[in-house]
């Protein structure tokens, strides 16, 4: 289980304690109440990153 | 072959409990979340509970919310159900059922069932 | 939680039939769409995921389409094992998942 305040999960994806693994962000705006999408909110996924170095 | 074999229902009185077990076989049990889905005679299929492949993460339709605790056994492939406050509301066939691999997708096997009779 | 509509809720065709299921949901769920088909005594069982998309094993003549608000179920060429009831799911709205209220597809 995830412990709290920590995320393992790599640049554009989040933790999903519903699925106890890494999702892709980019899932999100297509159904934005996966539990997963709380924690893409905080940081962009690398993608948005490239646009502003 | 993937098999799901519920067991643990029958005839209970209002208010009692029961305690529904799931065995699961044929796959490996630990990466998988599970759910709970039930159908009350000559009704349509209603999700119950879910819960996460490690049993962290848990989650109840607002009809059995505060009454009814999923849980699961990764060490004995075994997901459960257990019952309280039981109301006449609640009889039905008790599927459990495998998720998908990604997020709450789909339902690819599924139980044959136990059935749950509250009545007095 | 969002609603399913199916319709019709019921049907009567015969074999060599091409059947159409139809499926609304409330708002908008993308293609987080499933269809099961259940027979009388039996587990339901997984036949179209992601709305278009079809499980292993399950034959050809059965597809689905849509997405947004509006799905459709479609048998190309009804067989006397596909005599059932089919519900469609909705896993869009997470955890809340509903169901549709099903559509029984009989013997004329």
């Known amino acids: 289980e995830q412990a709290p305040g920590t995320s393992p999960c790599s640049s554009g994806s989040s933790w999903s304690a519903d699925l106890d693994k890494c999702m892709d962000c980019a899932s999100c705006p297509a159904r934005p109440h996966s539990d997963f999408c709380l924690g893409c909110a905080a940081a962009p996924p690398a993608h948005f990153r490239l646009l502003w170095p | 072959e993937v098999q799901l074999l519920e067991s643990g229902g029958g005839l209970v009185q209002p208010g009692g409990s029961l305690r529904l077990s799931c065995a699961a076989s044929?796959?490996?049990?630990?990466?998988?979340?599970m759910m709970w889905v039930r159908q009350a005679p000559g009704k349509g299929l209603e999700w119950v509970s879910y819960?996460?492949?490690?049993?962290?993460?848990?989650h109840y339709a607002d009809s059995v919310k505060g009454r009814f605790t999923i849980s699961r056994d990764n060490s004995k492939n075994t997901l459960y159900l257990q019952m309280n406050s039981l109301r006449a509301e609640d009889t039905a066939v008790y599927y459990c059922?495998?998720?998908?691999?990604?997020?709450?997708?789909?339902?690819?096997?599924w139980g044959q069932g136990t059935l749950v009779t509250v009545s007095s | 939680d969002i609603q399913m509509t199916q319709s019709p809720s019921s049907l009567s065709a015969s074999v060599g039939d091409r059947v159409t299921i139809t499926c609304r949901a409330s708002?908008?769920?993308?293609?987080?769409l499933n269809w099961y088909q259940q027979k009388p005594g039996k587990a339901p069982k997984l036949l179209i995921y992601?709305?278009?998309s079809l499980q292993s094993g399950v034959p050809s003549r059965f597809s689905g389409s849509g997405s947004g608000t509006d799905f459709t179920l479609t048998i190309s060429s009804l067989q006397p094992e596909d005599f059932a009831t089919y519900y469609c799911?909705?896993?869009?709205?997470?955890?809340?998942?509903?169901f549709g209220q099903g559509t029984k597809v009989e013997i004329k």
């Open positions: 992601a709305a278009s």
């Open positions: 708002q908008s769920i993308s293609s987080y």
């Open positions: 059922a495998r998720g998908g691999d990604t997020y709450f997708d789909y339902f690819d096997y």
């Open positions: 044929g796959f490996t049990f630990s990466p998988y979340p």
């Open positions: 819960i996460s492949p490690s049993g962290g993460s848990t």
């Open positions: 799911q909705q896993s869009y709205s997470t955890p809340g998942i509903t």
